[in-house]
Interface confidence: low
């Protein structure tokens, strides 16, 4: 570690007295203090001497001696004290600057060790200082104002008290900055547009930022728009805002607006598009498929999604038939806006009765007229069955009735005994029908198939059954021949006629 | 059938305001889309477009000389007018009004034009 | 403002031989989201308002003969008179109207050759 000569911690002396600094180390040393006129700086070898023979109170200060060549990287100092009547303050900076809750040292330096009692922080032309400023004083380097304040911007000057009057330093201008937590917070609005040609249109686009210094423009397809910035402070931010107007907009005014802010911190962007369209426009459409096919007592929800311009004037659900003048009730309608041009509503149907199928139609409204969207709802039913003896042309025949949607499948099975229902290890015979015949095929009902089973003599030991079935489920109808007839019944556990 | 007629005076001298008429039938202006349109010809020269109004009372200018037009729309008449003040001898022309059908901007039948001369 | 630039200024075709009249326009007058140019080719004769031939670029007029068709997309459009005829002597512009000021191209003189 180098040593100074004297070696003392502090030095004080008189204006125009003579001072010597010696620095003696094991290899080369330099000396570090603040810059100040006067000094003469005289090396040899491993010693350096700094010297003046008219010291000033602006050679006050402290003066450091390092070792490069040290890799404990020692230094020692001393201070220096030019006591000057007339000048109590040695100040080695005239504007400081530091980021908001960091300390900002004011490093006016007292050139009388003696004053210290007496030193004080004021404000320019004397004013005090701002309530809540926190700060600390040392004489080797000045007053220390801790966790600095943007508001605390303000011109400072010290104060010694010098034979009972209070001597100002020239002033220290401290510019505290507003911490930036990164670029300016963006907003355009809107966040999409649409117009007709000729229609007036506004988008704005508005950065702000703790810190004035801040750039902010609005630019169309890569084009920056020259627009008159408005500018506000309020909530502790600074606010710039461009304003587009567009008195009758065409379509070179379509396309891609981006709001751009820049600060030191980088940079913010935000786009949105414009739209302008010859006439006002309706579009419905569904993600849904329009023809629907739902099982009986299942709910569904119709959706339709509305793409207008402009908004809506009108909307409805209406129910077209074929069961009943019904209508959709309100309160199983519902509407959801995905945003300002688009929008989805929704008609709810708990519970379809078999009444309620059939076609319903969305219809919407707005300047460019009148839109509809029908969806065909069908609804699904298990089969229904039926068996009747009949004789067709002198034949004795089985007759079997299904209805049910989708058109169910017929199959005949033989079995020995009488049963509700023929099981595996009694069925003799199994007949399918691939083409029964269709009695029924009215839109959104069932549909109602027939298949006929021609028997020369019935076996009066065995069944008789018909099954139907379809993607909803299966029903069946057992016919037992007995001696005074015949007999026929449908199973115990019979699918339910909705 | 459409047919459009400009009427107005054929001298005008300078610093003094133009208004022409345009009276027309075969159409209604408050048929939705319907527009009608004003077009100058200098002798000799190209055509110029000037303004147009639409059936709902959009109108649109020629920017170059927006400051000096007007233009209206008396849909019971069936008639426009078209207003130009600060008449100059470079605005010596045919002045045509024309049909543009539904919101096109185009301009599909034309009246026969009438030839306004500024000259002191 | 779009320009609109027609050329050549004038033409000489002799009769029964195509003529062709070129347009061009400073920006696109296509308009993507219908696929629609908004262009439009007038024939004015001596002493006569302008009469239109065919608007959206390529659709004819009513009443206007098949002889005259017009072709092209964006910034490049053509009028093409297939077989001229003494009476197509005029003078043809071309039109914008996708964004105001609509204008006109300064014209084409056609004449007999």
């Known amino acids: 570690i180098p040593v100074i000569e004297p070696s003392v911690p502090e030095l004080v002396v008189k204006p125009g007295a003579t001072v010597t600094l010696r620095c003696v180390g094991n290899g080369s040393v330099e000396w570090d203090g603040p810059p100040s006129p006067h000094w003469t700086l005289y090396s040899d070898g491993s010693s350096s001497i700094l010297s003046t023979n008219n010291a000033t109170f602006q050679n006050t200060g402290t003066y450091r001696c390092t070792e490069p060549g040290d890799p404990l990287g020692g230094s020692a100092a001393i201070h220096l004290y030019v006591k000057d009547p007339a000048r109590p303050w040695n100040v080695l900076a005239q504007e400081v600057v530091v980021f908001e809750d960091q300390d900002a040292l004011l490093p006016c330096l007292l050139t009388d060790p003696v004053l210290e009692a007496g030193v004080s922080l004021v404000r320019v032309r004397g004013r005090p200082l701002m309530r809540h400023t926190n700060y600390s004083f040392s004489p080797w380097h000045g007053f220390t104002i801790h966790r600095a304040k943007f508001i605390q911007s303000q011109d400072y000057q010290c104060s010694a008290l010098m034979g009972g009057r209070k001597v100002m330093s020239i002033s220290i201008r401290l510019k505290v900055q507003k911490v930036i937590p990164g670029p300016p917070a963006l907003t355009l609005v809107p966040a999409e547009l649409v117009r007709i040609r000729g229609e007036a249109a506004q988008i704005v686009c508005s950065a702000s930022s703790v810190d004035v210094n801040f750039d902010v423009f609005l630019q169309h397809n890569n084009t920056k728009l020259a627009i008159p910035q408005q500018s506000d402070f309020h909530n502790n931010r600074y606010q710039k805002v461009l304003t587009l107007n567009l008195d009758q907009v065409d379509f070179q005014h379509a396309g891609n607006y981006s709001c751009v802010a820049s600060n030191v911190q980088g940079k913010h962007s935000t786009s949105m598009f414009f739209r302008v369209v010859e006439s006002a426009y309706l579009n419905l459409s569904s993600e849904q498929n329009l023809i629907q096919e739902v099982t009986v007592g299942e709910g569904l929800n119709l959706k339709v999604m509305v793409e207008a311009y402009p908004g809506l004037q009108g909307f409805n659900w209406t129910y077209l038939g074929p069961f009943s003048d019904h209508q959709p009730e309100p309160k199983l309608a519902n509407a959801t806006t995905k945003d300002t041009y688009r929008h989805t509503f929704t008609l709810s149907l708990p519970r379809l009765k078999p009444s309620e199928a059939g076609r319903y139609s969305f219809l919407a409204r707005n300047p460019g007229g009148w839109r509809a969207l029908t969806f065909e709802l069908t609804l699904r039913y298990p089969p229904e069955v039926s068996v009747i003896w009949t004789f067709i042309n002198g034949s004795g025949t089985l007759l079997c009735a299904a209805s049910g949607y989708p058109q169910p499948n017929v199959t005949w099975l033989q079995c020995s005994g009488h049963t509700d229902r023929c099981d595996e290890a009694q069925v003799l015979q199994v007949w399918d029908d691939p083409y029964p015949e269709v009695l029924s095929q009215e839109p959104f009902h069932k549909v109602t198939v027939q298949s006929l089973l021609t028997v020369e003599t019935l076996e009066h030991n065995q069944t008789y059954e018909c099954r139907a079935h379809n993607s909803v489920g299966s029903g069946s109808w057992a016919f037992i021949p007995i001696s005074a007839g015949a007999h026929t019944h449908p199973p115990d556990e019979f699918l339910f006629t909705p | 059938q459409i047919t459009l007629k400009e009427s107005g005076p054929p001298l005008v001298k300078p610093t003094q305001t133009l208004t022409l008429t345009c009276t027309f039938s075969?159409?209604?202006?408050?048929?939705?889309?319907?527009?009608v349109g004003w077009i100058r010809q200098p002798p000799g020269k190209a055509l110029e477009w000037l303004a147009l109004?639409?059936?709902?009372?959009?109108?649109r200018y020629s920017p170059s000389l927006k400051s000096r037009l007007t233009i209206t729309k008396d849909t019971s008449k069936n008639q426009v007018v078209l207003t130009m003040t600060n008449m100059d001898p470079v605005d010596t022309a045919t002045y045509y009004c024309?049909?543009?059908?539904?919101?096109?901007?185009?301009?599909?039948?034309w009246g026969q034009g009438t030839l306004v001369t500024v000259s002191s | 403002d779009i320009v609109m630039t027609q050329s050549p200024d004038s033409l000489a075709v002799s009769l029964g031989e195509r003529a062709t009249i070129n347009c061009k326009s400073s920006?696109?007058?296509?308009?993507?989201?219908?696929?629609?140019?908004?262009l439009a080719w007038y024939q004015q004769k001596p002493g006569q308002p302008p009469k239109v031939l065919i608007y959206?670029?390529?659709i004819r007029e009513s009443g206007v003969s098949d002889r005259f068709s017009g072709s092209g997309s964006g910034t490049d459009f053509t009028l093409t008179i297939s077989s001229l005829q003494a009476e197509d002597v005029a003078v043809y512009y071309c039109?914008?109207?996708?964004?105001?000021?609509?204008?006109f191209g300064q014209g084409t003189k056609l004449e007999i050759k």
């Open positions: 959206w670029a390529s």
């Open positions: 920006q696109s007058v296509l308009y993507s989201s219908n696929n629609k140019n908004y």
């Open positions: 109004i639409y059936w709902n009372d959009d109108k």
């Open positions: 075969g159409f209604s202006l408050s048929t939705s889309g319907v527009g």
């Open positions: 024309a049909h543009s059908p539904r919101y096109s901007g185009y301009f599909d039948y």
């Open positions: 039109q914008q109207y996708y964004s105001t000021p609509y204008t």
